[in-house]
Amino acid sequence: SITGISPITESLASLSTYNDQSITFALEDESYEIYVEDLKKDKKKDKVLLSYYESQHPSSESGDGVDGKMLMVTLSPTKDFWLQANNKEHSVELHKCEKPLPDQAFFVLHNRSFNCVSFECKTDPGVFIGVKDNHLALIKVDYSENLGSENILFKLSEILEHHHHHH
């Protein structure tokens, strides 16, 4: 359960892959598409508002036997839209929603070496946001393997301004 309905902190950041491709968001036909692309030098990186929540995670919920206090995150690139896991389609989508946010919008934050992060689905332990064919997708990671596979590693570049949406 998430320990409280308000985030403990928020930050504004641009999101890129381990290989320094940018995660961008484009409004197309009244819905948002998510792209993974090389940015032209002069193009500004898209910003994402990360809201961090604490969660007590009993081991029975988790496929990897992890229990204890977890740090969970929601990602919002534009007002009222949040990244969500679609476990049926193994996809990552942007949906307009109201608070309280659905569980599909929450991801367990994993810090990784080289100051990278990974995002694990709250609703499907062992499944992470990853890069597949220049799109974001949900990728199942075998816990017996190292979680260092590059396609689930992301870099957060913080943008230090007041943490409000900026549209």
């Epitope: 403990i8 902190t9 928020e10 930050s11 504004l12 961090y52 604490e54 995670h57 081991s59 990897d64 036997g65 992890v66 229990d67 204890g68 206090k69 977890m70 740090l71 367990v108 934050l109 994993h110 810090n111 070496s113 100051n115 694990e120 816990y143 190292n146 979680l147 260092g148 913080e158 230090l160 943490h163």
Partner: antibody, heavy 122, light 107 residues
Framework: QVQLVQSGAEVKKPGASVKVSCKAS????????ISWVRQAPGQGLEWMGW????????HYVQKFQGRVSMTTDTSTSTAYMELRSLRSDDTAVYYC???????????????WGQGTLVTVSS | DIQMTQSPSSVSASVGDRVTITCRAS??????LAWYQQKPGKAPQLLIY???SLQSGVPSRFSGSGSGSDFTLTISSLQPEDFATYYC?????????FGGGTKVEIK
């Protein structure tokens, strides 16, 4: 309740190695990362590195690279820090500390061992 | 590496005083900063994390604030048991780094 109990004080000669243990109890050991922090006499705190108790991944501060090894034994819920080629300026109290989030180092260290004094003297 | 600079290095205060300790980072980050209290011969104890979140069991006279490069620990009304050394620590990126410490002494 959560406890981290470290091994006793050590006196070592320059060039020797020391291995400090940190036995955890009161929580699921492989859920949380462990960091090692040292404090020279009368000085501040210095972070040495981190190990994931979950998968054994580790990250060491550059100045200790090649001289330090951090390991865990999940069967005994114990973390170890070995420092090799000891010098007199390695004389310090060495602490193990638990990260406060299971999968993240963002939250700082919520539980600490009592410290192990390592004296390096010829 | 992010360098953390604490000021003052020591402060003399009386019971009941309001004490403020600052921590400046060599490069800015949003909020992953922790504060610890350490008494002689003891291990540090976590007081504040995420810049302003009070660790469970810590008295409410301790508070933290700030983001970017400047962070503050405030003790609203100093108690006898608060005389100790205080350290900030950035938990934003590896290598994790500590400030040099601030010793709060009895005036």
């Amino acid at each position: 309740q959560v406890q981290l109990v470290q091994s006793g004080a050590e006196v070592k000669k320059p060039g020797a190695s020391v291995k400090v243990s940190c036995k955890a109890s009161g929580y699921t050991f492989n859920s949380y990362g462990i960091s090692w922090v040292r404090q020279a006499p009368g000085q501040g705190l210095e972070w040495m590195g981190w190990i994931s108790s979950h998968n054994g991944n580790s990250h060491y501060v550059q100045k200790f690279q090649g001289r330090v090894s951090m390991t865990t034994d999940t069967s005994t819920s114990t973390a170890y820090m070995e420092l090799r080629s000891l010098r007199s300026d390695d004389t310090a109290v060495y602490y193990c500390a638990r990260h406060s989030y299971t999968t993240s180092w963002y939250g700082g260290f919520d539980y600490w061992g009592q410290g192990t004094l390592v004296t390096v003297s010829s | 590496d992010i360098q953390m600079t604490q000021s003052p290095s020591s402060v003399s205060a009386s019971v009941g005083d309001r004490v403020t300790i600052t921590c400046r980072a060599s490069q800015g980050f949003s909020s992953w900063l922790a504060w610890y209290q350490q008494k002689p011969g003891k291990a540090p104890q976590l007081l504040i994390y995420a810049a302003s979140s009070l660790q469970s069991g810590v008295p409410s006279r301790f508070s933290g604030s700030g983001s970017g490069s400047d962070f503050t620990l405030t003790i609203s009304s100093l108690q006898p048991e608060d005389f100790a050394t205080y350290y900030c620590q950035q938990a934003n990126s590896f290598p994790l780094t500590f400030g040099g410490g601030t010793k709060v002494e009895i005036k």
